[in-house]
């Protein structure tokens, strides 16, 4: 049976918490990704940004989980209007910002 949206969001948050807590060396060797506007469509935008990071096992589960939240197919190189123009940040900072935002969504009961 499908996982309730609140459970799915909680599991995604748990995964991001694990990543931030277990981070020893620079996450994904310090790879840079496009910063996004943390507004509507955050899951697809986050996936569109993170999908361009390859060979980083630490975020593979996050990529798969985000894929479950995003209703359309996302492929590398694709980018929506939610990208912050010409701004790149380290994956570690991206994950931290995303985590803060998702925790707020959970606190506010916004699961979809």
């Amino acid at each position: 049976s499908p996982v309730p949206p609140s459970t799915a969001l909680k599991e995604l948050i748990e995964e991001l918490v694990n990543i931030t807590q277990n981070q020893k060396a620079p996450l994904c060797n310090g790879s840079m990704v496009w910063s996004i506007n943390l507004t509507a469509g955050v899951y697809c935008a986050a996936l569109e940004s993170l999908i361009n990071v390859s060979g980083c096992s630490a975020i593979e589960k996050t990529q798969r989980m985000l894929n479950g939240f995003c209703p359309h197919k996302v492929s590398a190189g694709q980018f929506s209007s939610l990208r912050v123009r010409d701004t790149k940040i380290e994956v570690a900072q991206f994950v931290k910002d995303l985590l803060v935002h998702l925790k707020k969504l959970f606190r506010e009961g916004q699961f979809n």
Epitope: K10, V17, V100, G109, F111
Partner: antibody, heavy 125, light 112 residues
Framework: QVQLVQSGAEVKKPGSSVKVSCKAS????????MHWVRQAPGQGLEWMGT????????KYVPKFQGRVTITADESTSTAYMELSSLRSEDTAVYYC??????????????????WGQGTLVTVSS | DVLMTQSPSSLSASVGDRVTITCRSS???????????LEWYQQKPGKAPKLLIY???DRFSGVPSRFSGSGSGTDFTLTISSLQPEDFATYYC?????????FGQGTKLEIK
């Protein structure tokens, strides 16, 4: 260290407006919710509303809707509470407070873990 | 609005006593995300309130272990196992589950 420093005491005439500021340091306000709570002399605490400084979204107590405006300026790490059409029963100490996520738990947003020192607003003709 | 009713409104006790303050909500305060955002605050005259307990029973960092919270649904309790001189203050329960968030009317704890 975490600090919330509020603006000084104000004396206002009925019908006027007051704007109280709350300067944050030691954390990023965009990671938090910022709240405003008031306490009339000898009375209990009353939650007025909150803002998410990351996007400007606000929630207000219906009783204050239309009279209160909560804003935040991320660039100066300052939250503001403006109350208009003041009446004598608005005489109170106004507190700002923050709630922030806990790195070590999945979903904990503390209700209000750090508070400003309070700002006394006196409404008198 | 959710009405939070504390009892008693005032209480006289001695150092070393075990004290229980109760808080009843006018409706169930389980949030849509499954958490119950019930907190307890302590306030001393002329000072800002201090967070003691969040999510019914989680003690905030630095709060002595003599403070504990319990309850579920609509009935909640704050217990001070052995009163210390610095514990004489006013205590407020608070619900952050349903907007508008609301405080109880307070319980003033005085020295007998």
């Amino acid at each position: 260290q975490v600090q919330l420093v509020q603006s000084g005491a104000e004396v206002k005439k009925p019908g006027s407006s007051v704007k109280v500021s709350c300067k944050a340091s030691g954390f990023y306000i965009k990671d938090t919710y910022m709240h405003w709570v008031r306490q009339a002399p000898g009375q209990g605490l009353e939650w007025m509303g909150t803002i998410d400084p990351a996007n400007g979204n606000t929630k207000y107590v219906p009783k204050f809707q239309g009279r209160v405006t909560i804003t935040a300026d991320e660039s100066t790490s300052t939250a503001y509470m403006e109350l208009s059409s003041l009446r004598s029963e608005d005489t109170a100490v106004y507190y700002c407070a923050r709630s922030i996520y806990d790195d070590y738990h999945v979903d904990d947003y503390y209700a209000m873990d750090y508070w400003g020192q309070g700002t006394l607003v006196t409404v008198s003709s | 609005d959710v009405l939070m009713t504390q009892s008693p409104s005032s209480l006289s006790a001695s150092v070393g006593d075990r004290v229980t303050i109760t808080c009843r909500s006018s409706q169930n305060i389980v949030h849509i995300n499954g958490n119950t955002y019930l907190e307890w605050y302590q306030q001393k005259p002329g000072k800002a309130p201090k967070l003691l307990i969040y999510k019914i029973s989680d003690r905030f960092s630095g709060v002595p272990s003599r403070f504990s919270g319990s309850g579920s649904g609509t009935d909640f309790t704050l217990t001070i196992s052995s009163l210390q001189p610095e514990d004489f203050a006013t205590y407020y329960c608070f619900q952050g589950s349903h907007v508008p968030w609301t405080f109880g009317q307070g319980t003033k704890l005085e020295i007998k």
